[in-house]
């Protein structure tokens, strides 16, 4: 598909509103520290330029690539060197190196203040005064904090954000209407960001073969009635979409995503019976709906896999003829029969099958050698099953907060070198697996839990890559994408770790503790818990529980006191001394 002007092509395909939104997201994800007004100015300049190209595709510079146009625009920012330091060096490079340079400088943990939610009346006034600016600000603030957020999906979130304000700012009780909707968007947004970050990590760190394997497994579970060739086509197209978005090519990505949705809706009969209600929706909703669609029912008459993949004398011949297709078909056939398995487990099974064929097809009697290959799958299947069972039992016994604390202790002991804020964030999110997955029926627990854990552990890997401190984390993160979770699960107490010196300042608290929200209080307590474990990695559960119970009692007591600050000043040192004694 060659066009004289790429920018004109995308403007016409996407329309002005989506074009401007996507360019704003792209710029905000690259230059995360730039003020909102600066980005809006750049976007307006690009949009005006695009319109001149729509009017005349052979106008000056209209034939330039989008990377060239956008990169040139970003490099006009006056404060680039002061604000971004060495990122300014990207501007001395030519495309495609310049874009690669910008991508490498995306910051997964930017030093930006947490978003504070103003009063409802203030937000509604801002929404009514200038709806366009209000929504642009939303795109900007989310995109700069989540530099890999799936851009076309962010437009969908913005549309829902707009709808929430349009509805709730007219309601009798604005807050009761709006706040739950905003909470839901925030939580869904964070989850969406983390899921997309794993897709990008998969593509960037392990290559498109890894992503394609993931997609074959997932789409085969979703569309078990679709033929292998149909699933392969969807995988090829989906890989292109995500490669583009992860590479900063947001206009192409959004355009190709729309094409994929169109294709799926025009070919429902050969894909899935579940697509119908998605296909009646407008574009952004439709694409979202298709991505989240439930698994179709499995065909009733699926034959045993053993016939083609174990019993057949032609296994090695078929494997040698077309390794990738044969393994792809194996993965497709296994996944469509097992919606009850996690994608990561399915990929481990495919990997084990491949390893067996590599070994056996070179043996004297290949058939004899691979005859028991399916038996070798059993321990691979049982490991995540047992893990889910044990952790769901623990979650049901403890409740979410204490389950998170158990994971905090577990992970701090495994990788005590990791920063406390990262351990708290990751363990809190690991702990959310309980509420998310343990209530589900047995057949849905493992895919929910293990694939969610993969997303959370990817966050640990991404943060750790920025400031590496633990060889064990680096090893688990880089050796194998599909074995990351088992690798972390297998880590034991780090015997080589030198305990952190006790710092009373870390355990000094003030009256401001009392005005924190319940969630913020939990984070404070969990931060203290991590620091305790770093100080005493061999502390027992009972010792840690005792200290944490004392801590909760101390905070509760001081928050009820008339002079809260005086209480914290007096009781704090006593708590510290008692804790040190309890852990001695």
């Amino acid at each position: 598909d060659t066009h004289k002007s790429e920018v004109a092509h995308r403007f016409k395909d996407l329309g002005e509103e989506h074009f401007k939104g996507l360019v704003l997201v792209a710029f905000s994800q690259y230059l995360q520290q730039c003020p909102f007004e600066e980005h809006v100015k750049l976007v307006n300049e690009v949009t005006e330029f695009a319109k001149t190209c729509v009017a005349d595709e052979s106008a000056e510079n209209c034939d330039k690539s989008l990377h060239t146009l956008f990169g040139d625009k970003l490099c006009t920012v006056a404060t680039l060197r002061e604000t971004y330091g060495e990122m300014a060096d990207c501007c001395a490079k030519q495309e495609p190196e310049r874009n690669e340079c910008f991508l490498q400088h995306k910051d997964d943990n930017p030093n930006l203040p947490p978003l504070v939610r103003p009063e409802v009346d203030v937000m509604c006034t801002a929404f009514h005064d200038n709806e366009a600016t209000f929504l642009k600000k939303y795109l900007y603030e989310v995109a700069r904090r989540h530099p890999y957020f799936y851009a076309p999906e962010l437009l969908f979130f913005a549309a829902r954000y707009k709808a929430a304000f349009a509805e709730c700012c007219q309601a009798a009780d604005k807050a009761a209407c709006l706040l739950p909707k905003l909470d839901e968007l925030r939580d869904e947004g964070k989850a969406s960001s983390a899921k997309q970050r794993l897709k990008c990590a998969s593509l960037q760190k392990f290559g498109d073969r890894a992503f394609k394997a993931w997609a074959v497994a997932r789409l085969s579970q979703k569309f078990p009635k679709a033929e292998f060739a149909e699933v392969s086509k969807l995988v090829t197209d989906l890989t292109k979409v995500h490669t583009e978005c992860c590479h900063g090519d947001l206009l192409e990505c959004a355009d190709d995503r729309a094409d994929l949705a169109k294709y799926m809706c025009e070919n429902q009969d050969s894909i899935s019976s579940k697509l119908k209600e998605c296909c009646d929706k407008p574009l952004l909703e439709k694409s979202h709906c298709l991505a989240e669609v439930e698994n179709d029912e499995m065909p009733a008459d699926l034959p045993s896999l053993a016939a083609d993949y174990v019993e057949s004398k032609d296994v090695c011949k078929n494997y040698a003829e077309a390794k990738d297709v044969f393994l792809g078909m194996f993965l497709y056939e296994y996944a469509r029969r097992h919606p009850d398995y996690s994608v990561m487990l399915l990929l481990r099974l495919a990997k084990a099958y491949e390893a067996t064929l590599e070994k056996c097809c070179a043996a004297a009697d290949p058939h004899e050698c691979y005859a028991k290959v399916f038996d070798e799958f059993q321990p691979l299947v049982e490991e995540p099953q047992n893990l889910v069972k044990q952790n769901c039992e623990l979650f049901e016994q403890l409740g979410e907060y204490k389950f998170q604390n158990a994971l905090l202790v577990r992970y701090t002991k495994k990788v005590p070198q990791v920063s406390t804020p990262t351990l708290v964030e990751v363990s809190r999110n690991l702990g959310k697996v309980g509420a998310k997955c343990c209530k589900l029926p047995e057949a849905k627990r493992m895919p929910c839990a293990e694939d969610y854990l993969s997303v959370v552990l990817n966050r640990l890997c991404v943060l750790h890559e920025k400031t590496p401190v633990s060889e064990k984390v680096t090893k688990c993160c880089t050796e194998s994408l599909v074995n990351r979770r088992p690798c972390f699960s297998a880590l034991e107490l780090d015997e080589a770790y030198v305990p952190k010196a006790f710092n009373a300042e870390t355990f000094t608290f003030h009256a401001d503790m009392c005005t924190l929200s319940e969630k913020e209080k939990q984070v404070k307590k969990q931060t203290a818990l991590v620091e305790l474990v770093k100080h005493k990695p061999k502390a027992t559960k009972e010792q840690l529980k005792g200290v944490m119970d004392n801590f909760a009692a101390f905070v509760e007591k001081c928050c009820k006191a008339d002079d809260k600050e005086a209480c914290f000043a007096e009781e704090g040192p006593k708590f510290v001394a008692a804790s040190q004694a309890a852990l001695a």
């Epitope: 292998f228 060739a229 149909e230 392969s232 090829t236 197209d237 083609d308 297709v325």
Partner: nanobody, 117 residues
Framework: EVQLLESGGGLVQPGGSLRLSCAAS????????MGWVRQAPGKGLEWVSL????????YYADSVKGRFTISRDNSKNTLYLQMNSLRAEDTAVYYC??????????WGQGTLVTVSS
């Protein structure tokens, strides 16, 4: 009944190019994944490429990646294989084949490609 008729084979020098065509009839061409398979003298069958009804390429054998291009024209019920930078080891009978669900179910008679100086 299903018919697949290959053409375009012949003798070509190393480094040269050929374009194979396959005219299909007897089935709804634009509903099926199609492919090319080859058999070198004295060797077994080797998959070359697979293409989805939409024109999305599903597969190329590693041995031909970057040199061969599969395409189709659904309006003409025709499958193509453009072969560039041909090598002696590409010498084979090339078969056009129709894919159904899990395997090729119909084959053409084949066209011989000989790469030799």
């Amino acid at each position: 009944e299903v018919q697949l008729l290959e053409s375009g084979g012949g003798l070509v020098q190393p480094g040269g190019s050929l374009r194979l065509s396959c005219a299909a009839s007897g089935f709804t061409f634009n509903h099926y994944t199609m492919g090319w398979v080859r058999q070198a003298p004295g060797k077994g069958l080797e998959w070359v490429s697979l293409i989805h009804p939409s024109g999305t390429v599903i597969y190329y054998a590693d041995s031909v990646k970057g040199r061969f291009t599969i395409s189709r024209d659904n309006s003409k019920n025709t499958l193509y294989l453009q072969m560039n930078s041909l090598r002696a080891e590409d010498t084979a009978v090339y078969y056009c084949a129709k894919w159904s669900s899990r395997a090729f179910d119909y084959w053409g008679q084949g066209t011989l490609v000989t790469v030799s100086s």
